[in-house]
C-alpha cells in the first residue's frame, strides 16, 4: 500500500490523543534506555509504511502485536485516513488466519514496540532531517 | 459462528437523524474492535467510525460532529447515531467486527438522505 495520500495531521493527532498511551502502557515496567532504535524511516510515507511493517507482520521471537490496543486503533486510523487502505486489508487479514499465535509478552515484541515509539515520533517530526 | 445484523436504515430528509444499530453474537464483544463502514454508488468503502474496547473512539472527517458511535457491551450492540444527515450520507451501512486476522461484516443497511 503506497501511504503518500494518507491524511498525516489526523494520524498524528490520533497517535498523540490514544495510540501513544497505549505504547506507553504496553511498555511498562520497560526502562527507555533499554533498547536501541534501529529501525527509522525518512518521511512520513516510509514511517507509516515501516510503522504498519512492525505492527502486523509477525517476526521471530515476536509473533504477533496485531491483538494489542495499539495495533487495533493503529489498523483503524489508517483505515479511516488512508483512502483505499481497508479495502487492502480485508484480503491480507484473511491470509494471516493461518499463522495466528497466542498472544504472548516477549523480550522481543518489547523491542519491537520500542521501535515503533521510534518510529511514530519521527512520524510526529517530519521536517527534523535524518541524523 | 459470527453474526452481526443491523437495523435502524431508512429514508430520512436532510438534517433529519437516524440511528443504527448493530446487533452481534459469537464473539465476546469486548474483545475486538467495532466498526461502521459505509458504501455510496459507485464510490469505495469507507470506515466512517470506529470504537474500541477501551472506550475511545475514531471518526473520519466527513461526520465528526454529526456521528456518534457508542456500545452496549451487555446487549453486544453496537451504534451510530447520525445527526445532521446530508445527501452524501446516502449509502448502505456496513457494521464490522474487526480482529487481527479476518474483518467480519453485516449484511447492510440502507440510508437514503432525501426531500
Known amino acids: 500500500y503506497d501511504f503518500t495520500n494518507c491524511d498525516f495531521e489526523k494520524i498524528k493527532a490520533a497517535y498523540l490523543s490514544t495510540i501513544s498511551k497505549d505504547l506507553i502502557t504496553y511498555m511498562s515496567g520497560t526502562k527507555s534506555t533499554e533498547f536501541n532504535n534501529t529501525v527509522s524511516c525518512s518521511n512520513r510515507p516510509h514511517c507509516l509504511t515501516e510503522i504498519q511493517s512492525l505492527t502486523f507482520n509477525p517476526t521471530a521471537g515476536c509473533a504477533s502485536l496485531a491483538k494489542e490496543m495499539f495495533a487495533m486503533k493503529t489498523k483503524a486510523a489508517l483505515a479511516i485516513w488512508c483512502p483505499g487502505y481497508s479495502e487492502t486489508q480485508i484480503n491480507a487479514t484473511q491470509a494471516m488466519k493461518k499463522r495466528r499465535k497466542r498472544k504472548v509478552t516477549t523480550n522481543k515484541c518489547l523491542e519491537q514496540v520500542s521501535q515503533l515509539q521510534g518510529l511514530w515520533r519521527r512520524f510526529n517530526r517530519p521536517l527534523l532531517k535524518q541524523q | 459462528e459470527v453474526q452481526l445484523v443491523e437495523s435502524g436504515g431508512g429514508l430520512v430528509q436532510p438534517g433529519g437523524s437516524l440511528r443504527l444499530s448493530c446487533a452481534a453474537s459469537g464473539f465476546t464483544f469486548s474483545s475486538y474492535w467495532m466498526g461502521w463502514f459505509r458504501q455510496a454508488p459507485g464510490k469505495e468503502r469507507e470506515l466512517v467510525s470506529a470504537?474500541?474496547?477501551?472506550?475511545?473512539?475514531m471518526y473520519a472527517d466527513s461526520v465528526k460532529g454529526r456521528f456518534t458511535i457508542s456500545a452496549d457491551n451487555s446487549k453486544n450492540t453496537a451504534y451510530l447515531q447520525m445527526n445532521s444527515l446530508k445527501p452524501e450520507d446516502t449509502a448502505v451501512y456496513y457494521c464490522?467486527?474487526?480482529?487481527?486476522?479476518?474483518?467480519?461484516w453485516g449484511q447492510g443497511t440502507l440510508v437514503t438522505v432525501s426531500s
Open positions: 464490522t467486527r474487526d480482529s487481527t486476522d479476518t474483518r467480519y
Open positions: 470504537i474500541f474496547s477501551d472506550g475511545s473512539t
